[in-house]
Interface confidence: low
């Protein structure tokens, strides 16, 4: 009969740096042997060879040595391709061409994505502001893909579209840094929010700045930090923003600045006696010395770890003193789930199978949802376990026990509740008797 080659209709979405499975399956006839199989993966547009299997053996990767087949599953009709350490340049269409006696092919799209960082906000000018002044607010978010959508709104949620200039620049890896500039005339006070949206991940990164133009009473130190937690990806750098209002004639010799852990009061970083006293926190913190005199007491925390999560207090003393606490929320995206099936061959309607969905190295703990091919949630007979590794990152394993119908698709969605990042995997079980063509 005709050789049917099946691939997912929807693009496979993969985070930069993770591994992706480009699913492809065919229907082997009875008596099929791998010696008969010619399998070619190639780039759809250029026909560049990516990986092949011929003459009964894996001919290996022709694509930067980052591809692999699933040799143990080929005989069952699983021609899927594993692409490791995904890069932006990998984005596009891959064709799976299978030839036995008949031949067939199908193309699967790879959509590459990378989450945007929590935006940083800067203000120019940033002191002695009065109602009626024009200020430039810059919102910067880094290392995302594809290009972001940027939205500004005021404190009432009203969109601000006039006087906005947004630029996006790709680095050598193809990841975008986005800088959006809003020019606005100050009222008595105001909050300005910037939202950077990754259109593929449907990930929104928010920041806001509240500007209160009126001057502080003489001597009082107003310390301001963001209301919302600062969200930082594991391994990246985070800025814990803190600002105060220096009086005219203020000198750094007057300043005592202490950053400490809110709960334990453990010292993190300090500035006193006119100089930076350095990091007391694993040598991973730094101030912005050139900005201190302007009232910027922000702290840079490098190479963020899960253990850094929590509340940090910024304490400023000049003549008077003031303090405020900012929360650091650490996050790490979950990997594309891998799906396994037990048993995985000679399946018949009425059989009970165990489908395991595994996703790795995320933080915080994931929410896991199962649904069938119609999108109906499956809640019975689901067991989900999450185990933290030594870095505090979670591996999640969710097991669904299900009685097979005539055919069925079972989808697993692993959600990072902080990043609002959803990683999907699905498996389609068809035929009678059925085999297992996984559709990751």
């Amino acid at each position: 009969g005709a050789l049917e080659v099946q691939v997912p209709e929807d693009p496979v979405v993969a985070l930069v740096g993770t591994d992706a499975t480009l699913c492809c399956s065919f229907s082997p006839e009875p008596g099929f042997s791998l010696a008969q199989l010619n399998l070619i993966w190639q780039l759809t547009d250029t026909k560049q060879l990516v990986h092949s299997f011929a003459e009964g053996q894996d001919q290996g990767s022709a694509y930067a040595n980052r591809t692999a087949l699933f040799p143990d599953l080929l005989a069952q009709g699983n021609a899927s391709l594993r692409l490791q350490r995904v890069r932006v340049a990998d984005e596009g269409s891959f064709t799976c061409f299978v030839s036995i006696r008949d031949f067939g092919s199908a193309a699967v799209s790879l959509q590459v994505a990378a989450p945007y960082s929590k935006p940083s906000m800067t203000l120019e000018p940033n002191k002695d502001l009065r109602p009626g002044d024009t200020v430039t607010i810059t919102c910067s978010s880094y290392q995302g893909y594809p290009e972001a959508e940027v939205f500004w709104q005021d404190g009432q949620g009203v969109p601000l579209t006039g006087n906005v200039t947004t630029s996006q620049m790709a680095n050598e890896q193809g990841l975008f840094d986005v800088h959006s500039i809003l020019r606005v005339v100050l009222g008595a006070n105001g909050t300005y929010s910037c939202l950077v949206r990754n259109p593929v991940l449907q990930q929104d990164a928010h920041s806001s700045v509240t500007i209160t133009p009126q001057r502080s009473p003489t001597g009082a130190v107003e310390v301001q930090v963001p209301e919302d937690p600062v969200v930082a990806l594991v391994g990246t750098d985070a800025t814990l923003r803190c600002s105060f209002s220096p009086e005219p004639g203020f000198s750094l010799a007057q300043l005592n600045l202490i950053w400490q852990l809110t709960d334990t009061k453990q010292l993190v970083h300090s500035f006193t006696e006119g100089r930076d006293q350095g990091s007391a926190y694993a040598n991973r913190t730094a101030l912005f010395p050139d900005l201190l005199a302007q009232g910027n007491a922000s702290l840079r925390l490098q190479r963020v770890r899960v253990a850094d999560e929590g509340s940090f207090t910024c304490f400023v003393s000049i003549r008077d003193f003031g303090s405020a606490a900012v929360s650091l929320q650490v996050a790490a995206p979950y990997s594309k789930p891998s799906m396994t099936l037990e048993p995985n061959k000679d399946l018949r309607p009425g059989d009970t199978v165990t489908i395991t969905c595994s996703s790795y190295r995320g933080y915080p703990e994931a929410e896991v949802f199962w649904q069938d091919g119609q999108g109906v949630p499956l809640t019975g007979n689901v067991t989900t376990s999450q185990m933290a590794n030594e870095q505090g990152l979670f591996d999640v394993h969710s097991v669904l026990r299900v009685v097979l119908g005539a055919n069925g698709t079972y989808s697993c969605l692993v959600r990072n509740p902080v990043l609002q990042q959803d990683a999907h995997g699905s498996v389609t079980i068809t035929g009678q008797p059925m085999t297992f063509p996984p559709e990751a």
Partner: antibody, heavy 119, light 108 residues
């Protein structure tokens, strides 16, 4: 810009039939599930029927099951609601809505079309 | 089907007031809940999705919270344009995803 425009409403006698249409534009219609929501005069909202993106799965409120049929033509970017054996209690404004992704609510609604069942 | 019970069914309040509307599901809906605002003669407008996420373009005075079976819509400081009818709707399980019966918010 996402737009949903309903048509086909009007006055019909009890026991009669009517077909509502919803013309969709501004988005990839074939990628989204769709629903019909109705609102009787002075009453609340009721989701009467829903259909998935390829039309393979349909769902109905108990109050209309067996009498109403939801369907779609992805080539024409159009959603339909075939209503038969109409009753006085089916009198309502009928809204066409787009089903957003998981947990995201009904963000886009048409302006509504009024169906009046009366002798 | 899951039943959604909204309370109160009507409410009188003044501009500047803080207002809370609650919605109770007949079973756990796992935060799969949306809130809508509807003004006379108009289609409903989505305010909150996934129990607590503010829909783009909706003023920040609106907020949602809750989990399990109990959910709340809060308007922190009522504005004149907020007088309307509010509905909750669950998105758990198969359609039809039922609405609450509505809460009419009137000027005191």
């Amino acid at each position: 810009e996402v737009q949903l425009v309903e048509s086909g409403g009007g006055l019909v006698q009890p026991g009669g039939s009517l077909r509502l249409s919803c013309a969709a534009s501004g988005f990839t219609f074939s990628s989204y599930g769709m629903s019909w929501v109705r609102q009787a005069p002075g009453k609340g909202l009721e989701l009467v029927a829903a259909i998935n993106s390829n039309g393979g799965s349909t769902y109905y409120a108990d109050s209309v099951k067996g009498r109403f049929t939801i369907s779609r033509d992805n080539a024409k970017n159009t959603l339909y609601l075939q209503m038969s054996s109409l009753r006085a209690e089916d009198t309502a404004v009928y809204y066409c809505t787009r089903n957003e992704e998981f947990r995201r609510g009904l963000a886009y609604w048409g302006q509504g079309t009024l169906v009046t069942v009366s002798s | 089907d899951i039943q959604m019970t909204q309370s109160p069914s009507s409410l009188s309040a003044s501009v500047g007031d803080r207002v809370t509307i609650t919605c109770r599901a007949s079973e756990n809906i796992y935060s799969n809940l949306a809130w809508y605002q509807q003004k006379p003669g108009k289609a409903p407008k989505l305010l909150i999705y996934a129990a607590s996420n503010l829909q783009s373009g909706v003023p920040s005075r609106f907020s949602g919270s809750g989990s399990g079976t109990d959910y709340t819509l809060t308007i922190s400081s009522l504005q004149p344009e907020d007088f309307a009818t509010y509905y909750c709707q669950h998105f758990w399980g198969t359609p039809p995803w039922t609405f609450g019966q509505g809460t009419k918010l009137e000027i005191k």
